[in-house]
Every structure is written in C-alpha cells, then in structure tokens.
C-alpha cells in the first residue's frame, strides 16, 4: 500500500502552502525506501536516494515555480510514481448568512473569506437549539446535527425545510480543502432572518371619473405559505414620473387607492411586504408598475363664481375579488380617511 495519505482532491495531486516547507511523497514505494526525484520534463536530479529522506522530497520555502509534476523512482530506476504539486492556503472560516422568505424554511449561503487556490468543498449541517426551562435562558443542542442539503450544480447554498418559527438553529458551514478545514457556526432564528419575497402581481389602474386617483392591487408572494396564522403587512410607494421622491403609505390589505396623484401624469408604484408582527425585515420592493389617473369629468352642478363646490367622494361600487391569500383586512378599504379630498373647480 502507498505510504502517501491521499488528501481530499484529485488523485496524484499533493498540496503545500507558499512560503512553507513542502514534503512530496512517492506513492509507489514502501515507506522509507530511498528514491530519486526529478521534475517532469527536466532531467537533472532534484534529490537523490542518499538524501536520508526516504520516499519524501522536501522543498524548502515552496513558491509558484515549484508547482508542477514530479517523478520519483526507486534505486534501480523503476518509476515510483508521478506527483503533481499544487500550492495554496488552508481554509479560512467562510462567510455565512442565512435568510428566510417564509416562516417554514430558510436557506444559508456562504463564500470563502479567503481564496485558498485549492479544490474546496463545504460541509453544511444544522441543529435545533431548544430552551430547557420556561424561565431558563440556557440553551442546549437537541438532537442533530442534521445535514443542510446543498443546492445542486455547486451553488453555495443549502436549505432547511420545515423549520420551526419560534426555534433557534445553529448552522455549521465547514470549508474543507486538502490542507485542512475551518468552521463557521452561526446562530439564527427564523424570526430575525425572515424577509418575505416582494408582493406579486402589482397592478395600477385609474379610477374612472377621478383624475387624482389610482387603484393599486397585488397578491401575496407565491413563496409565502398559505396559512392564516402568519400574515403579511405591506408598504406602498408611489411617485409621478420624473419626480425624485416617493410617497409612502401602509395599506391595510391587498389594495390601496391613491387619492393625491398628479392628474395627467403617469405614476410609478411599488410594494414591499413584511411579517405583520414585525419579525425580520421588509422585503425588497416589487418591480414598479405604472398607471395614469383618468381624465376628470365635468360635475353635474356648476358652482357660482367665487364659490368652490366640493363634490363628495362617492366611488362607484367595485366588485373587489377576495384576496387569494390571507391579509389583515381581507376586504381592503377603497377610501382612506387620510386621503385628501379631490376638489374640482370649474371656472366660467
């Protein structure tokens, strides 16, 4: 059997660190057998069998010029093997972050904090941490760890399915390369990392007869589980075209009527979502949707000159479809007492 331990990585490759002494091992001989070493493609002897180093080649303070293939041979000239030296660095603790788009699953992503230059893999696992007593703050690992299944195709991500919203988890991401391993432990709670996906299906429509109104509607993100226990709240922003500042409102449901739009101008609208009890953070904004208020209609009563007649806000009844997912207010308000009253002044 070979005297050379096979490091994780491709066969026939051995590894070292720049600036450090590197030992190469001749794989096809018995441990301690004296061998000769050559660089592949160079006939001069690098180290002879009388070196006292047996089956090993020692390269002091290796640098990039030492990378390449080496040949070792026995005393009588038989090939002992070929070894390729690759230089790099031991793993450093990876950078790990976790996020959840819903309250049942979360994913963790990682990246190396230092490039090792060597073949690298990651071991990912998690364990659930439980509170031992009602009053105790002391936490201890429960059963586990369990593997955190990694995405295929080498994406640096693993997903924990069926997580418990109120539990805390310890994530272990270990970077492994032929020179060692380094672990990052991260404690996460679903409540703190929850960040819903942005709402979907945002539509912006004019309200016929109301030149300063726009009706926006949207749906829950598809990734949010369909259970009534965990609701989302929303934040809506809108602005006229070419206007730098957004106006922000917090709708109560899945629809909002904007009553202070600028007549005749297209408006950008976007929405964001968050757990209704303020767990985690707001989602990113949805893609913008655009709408332009309808042109105003002339009211039936024309006020006398100098008088401004305020036409009461009476909206035509609109059949609002029931939201497909739970919301704080399943039938959203069409009017909002906070909105300014539209006034139509007709000058003779």
């Amino acid at each position: 059997s070979s005297p050379c331990p096979q490091a994780w990585g491709p066969p026939g490759v051995q590894y070292g660190q720049p600036g450090r002494s590197v030992k190469l091992c001749c794989p096809g001989v018995t441990a301690g057998d004296p061998v000769s070493w050559f660089r592949d493609g160079e006939p001069k002897l690098l180290q002879g069998p009388d070196s006292g180093l047996g089956h090993e080649l020692v390269l002091a303070q290796a640098d990039s010029t030492d990378e390449g293939t080496y040949i070792c041979q026995t005393l009588d000239g038989a090939l002992g093997g070929t070894v390729t030296l690759q230089l790099g660095y031991p793993p450093a603790r990876p950078v790990v972050s976790c996020q959840a788009a819903d309250y049942e699953n979360f994913s963790c992503t990682w990246s190396p904090s230092q490039i090792s230059g060597l073949p690298t893999r990651y071991l990912t696992s998690y364990r659930k941490k439980t509170v031992l007593g009602a009053d105790s703050q002391r936490r201890s690992p429960s059963t586990g760890p369990w593997p955190c299944p990694q995405d295929p195709l080498g994406a640096a991500r693993c997903v924990v399915h069926g997580a418990e919203f109120w539990s805390q988890y310890r994530i272990n991401v270990t970077e492994v390369n032929p020179l060692g391993a380094s672990t990052r432990l991260l404690d996460v709670s679903l409540q703190s990392i929850l960040r819903p996906d942005p709402p979907q299906g945002l539509r912006v429509e004019s309200v016929p007869g109301y030149p300063r109104r726009l009706r926006a509607s949207w749906t829950y993100p598809a990734s949010w589980p369909c259970q009534p226990h965990f609701l989302l709240k929303f934040r809506l922003q809108y602005r006229p075209a070419q206007h730098p500042a957004w106006s922000t409102v917090e709708p109560a449901g899945l629809e909002e009527v904007i009553t202070d739009a600028v007549a005749g101008l297209p408006h950008a609208v976007r929405v964001s979502a968050r757990d209704f009890l303020d767990a985690g953070t707001w989602s990113t904004w949805s893609p913008e949707a655009w709408g332009t208020p309808s042109t105003g209609t002339i009211p039936k009563e024309i006020p006398a000159w100098g008088q401004l007649h305020t036409q009461p806000e009476v909206e035509p009844q609109v059949d609002s479809p029931a939201p497909p997912r739970p919301s704080l207010q399943p039938h959203p308000r069409l009017l909002d007492h906070r909105d300014s009253v539209e006034q139509v002044a007709v000058l003779a």
Partner: antibody
Framework: QVQLVQSGAEVKKPGASVKVSCKAS????????MHWLRQRPGQGLEWIGN????????HYNQKFKDRVTMTVDKSTSTAYMELSSLRSEDTAVYYC??????????WGQGTLVTVSS | DIVLTQSPATLSLSPGERATLSCRAS??????LHWYQQKPGQAPRLLIK???QSISGIPARFSGSGSGTDFTLTISSLEPEDFAVYFC?????????FGQGTKLEIK
C-alpha cells in the same frame, strides 16, 4: 535476468524509413523508461530520446524530433523506434536501453542501420 | 546543448597503474554526470552515476569525483579488462549528451 533483444540489421535507401524493435524480458516492462541511442561508426554516443514507462510520454532530442517516433506495445513488452527521411549520416548502430529517467542501465545488443543508395 | 569535452582522447597505461580520465562540461551541471565503459563490439556499461555514486556490480577500483564543470573518473589499479573506451554523459538538461570518449589503451 533483464534482456533487451533488438531486431536485425537493416539496409535502407535515402529518404526511406526504418523501424527498429526492442523486446524486453526479465522485468516489469511498464516500470522503466526506454531510451534510444545511436553510435555512428567510430563516433561517440548520441541520445535520440526516451519513452515513459506507463504513460508513453516521450522526450525527443530536438535534433531528431521531426523524424523520430517512439512507441511501445505493452502487451508484448516491445518498444519501437521509427526514424524517417533517412540520409547517409543516419548510418549507425541503434541501441535501446532500459533506464531510469536519464540513465541507461541495461542495453540491447544494437541494430546496425545502413543507409545507402 | 551542453557540450562535454573529454581528455585525453587517448590514454596509454600499463596494468596496475592508476588511470585518471577527465570530463569538462560547457556549463555547470552540478553532479548530474555519469560514466560508461564500452568495449569493442559491445554496448556501453554504466560505471558511476551522479559524479561519484557507485553502481552495483562495478568493481570498487572505479571511482568518480567532481561537481559543477570538472569531473574525474579514476581507476585505482588497472586490470587488463579495463582497457576500453570511456564516455561521460550529462543529465542536467535535454538533450542528454555524451563526451566524445577517452580510449584507454595498453601501453
């Protein structure tokens, strides 16, 4: 014991090719390099090249690289050296030699190649 | 290519005498220098490798020395069978090259 038995003498015309064989026995063929050398009449030794034991990787003397091809048949433990575009100055005794990467420890008996019109 | 120059071209000595053969390289080759003996009608035989390392089966009267560019093969006490042609060979760089030989003849 190690033995390298080469093919017999050849007479070739200028421009022709010659293929010399070297049958090895008495050792594990794929553990050692095979070198080819030649010695012109009354002259010194000239290294033509070598072929690797397991991967058939070759190192050729640049002087011959456009004209020489070294191959092995592992199933019969035989090495071959073919030299093309022969000229009169290629008249020599051609040797195969088992060696390590750069040394020649066991030699064949030699094959005389005569190039003459 | 590295050129090896052997001297003398011919050395005439009597059995029992000490023979000293020289090989000079056109550039420094460390200890990557080897010695061969060739008798008429025979293939060469390896005598010394890496300037001074002995070869199994070779009589102890053969020894080598030197490093860099200057190398010496010494036969401490000549035997009748030692009269032959001696070649040096370098393995410092491709192509592997030989000296032109020193003929050791009986005086």
């Amino acid at each position: 014991q190690v033995q390298l038995v080469q093919s017999g003498a050849e007479v070739k015309k200028p421009g022709a090719s010659v293929k010399v064989s070297c049958k090895a026995s008495g050792y594990t063929f794929t553990n050692y390099w095979m070198h080819w050398l030649r010695q012109r009449p009354g002259q010194g030794l000239e290294w033509i090249g070598n072929i690797g034991p397991s991967d058939s990787k070759t190192h050729y003397n640049q002087k011959f690289k456009d004209r020489v091809t070294m191959t092995v048949d592992k199933s019969t433990s035989t090495a071959y050296m073919e030299l093309s575009s022969l000229r009169s100055e290629d008249t020599a005794v051609y040797y195969c030699a088992r060696g390590d990467y750069v040394l020649f420890t066991y030699w064949g008996q030699g094959t005389l190649v005569t190039v003459s019109s | 290519d590295i050129v090896l120059t052997q001297s003398p071209a011919t050395l005439s000595l009597s059995p029992g005498e000490r023979a000293t053969l020289s090989c000079r390289a056109s550039q420094s080759i460390s200890n990557n220098l080897h010695w061969y003996q060739q008798k008429p009608g025979q293939a060469p035989r390896l005598l010394i490798k890496y300037a001074s390392q002995s070869i199994s089966g070779i009589p102890a009267r053969f020894s080598g020395s030197g490093s860099g560019t200057d190398f010496t093969l010494t036969i401490s006490s000549l035997e009748p069978e030692d009269f032959a042609v001696y070649f040096c060979q370098q393995s410092y760089s491709w192509p592997l090259t030989f000296g032109q030989g020193t003929k050791l003849e009986i005086k």
